[in-house]
């Protein structure tokens, strides 16, 4: 879509408590999209998270990243994404990791695999039509 | 700016019933969260109910709250009301109308939520 990836610098980092708001509208003919807590701002850099809801399987893969190297998959209960649908992603970190929760209800607790304060970039993509990253 | 106008507050029997609205203007931005909550004389305001724009999403409820009370809102009209049935000694309090920047329940410790913008009150007294 025209208006990703979006890229939002964490200079400060982020802390237990932060609050990471996504809100967007999943394209009638999306495949998958992702949400990226990358280590740094340059190509390749950790992934601290990786959330990746895949319409085209009909699963929802959280992961992470380090040194270029993949970790092993989770996934999320069900898939509580909908093309055509719009929808509101929280990404809430804490001491052991991170929550997401999606719509009215928690959705998965992926734990930290990398600490938390080398985090320093959102990035959203994919087939994804944004509205809004906030962080709280 | 987002101005929010809160209305319908009043004095009411105990088993009564009122209903409140809150109407958002300004530069509120598509899609938002809109919510109530209450202070009592003496104590901390107080999460009552939050509704999303979208309506595939359900509405949050505060459990002193649950089944006498109901949520609703136009979004033609940037509005949001509560309905409220079965009022209590309890339910009095100033009544205040918010956008909600975001909401999530956290098991028994209630719902966590972050507030963008409050509106003023409207007092609602429920005594015989």
């Known amino acids: 879509m025209s208006n990703v990836p979006h890229k939002s610098s964490l200079p400060e980092g982020i802390r237990p408590g932060t609050v990471l708001r996504i809100r967007g509208l999943v394209p009638p003919n999306a495949s998958r999209f992702h949400v990226n807590l990358l280590c740094g701002e340059e190509q390749g850099s950790d992934a601290a998270l990786h959330f990746n809801p895949r319409l085209d399987t009909s699963e929802v893969v959280f992961n992470s990243k380090e040194q270029g190297s993949w970790g092993r998959e989770e996934r999320g209960p069900g898939v509580p994404f909908q093309r055509g649908q719009p929808f509101e992603v929280l990404i809430i970190a804490s001491d052991d990791g991170f929550k997401a929760v999606v719509g009215d209800a928690q959705y998965h607790h992926f734990r930290h695999r990398l600490p938390l304060a080398r985090v320093r970039l959102v990035e959203v993509g994919g087939d994804v039509q944004l509205d809004s990253v906030r962080i709280f | 700016e987002v101005q929010l106008q809160a209305s319908g507050g009043g004095f009411v029997q105990p088993g009564g019933s009122l209903r409140l609205s809150c109407a958002a203007s300004g530069s509120t931005s598509y899609g938002e969260t809109m919510g109530w909550f209450r202070q009592a004389p003496g104590k901390e305001r107080e999460f009552v109910s939050a509704i999303s724009y979208y309506s595939t999403r359900k509405p949050y409820y505060a459990d002193s709250v649950k089944g006498r009370f109901t949520i609703s809102r136009d979004n033609s009209k940037n509005t949001v009301y509560l309905q409220m049935n079965s009022l209590r000694a309890e339910d009095t309090a100033t009544y205040y109308c918010?956008?909600?920047?975001?909401?999530?329940?956290?098991?028994?410790?209630?719902?966590?939520?972050?507030?963008?913008?409050w509106g003023q009150g409207t007092q609602v007294t429920v005594s015989s």
């Open positions: 918010a956008i909600v920047a975001y909401i999530y329940a956290d098991g028994v410790r209630g719902y966590h939520q972050k507030i963008d913008y």
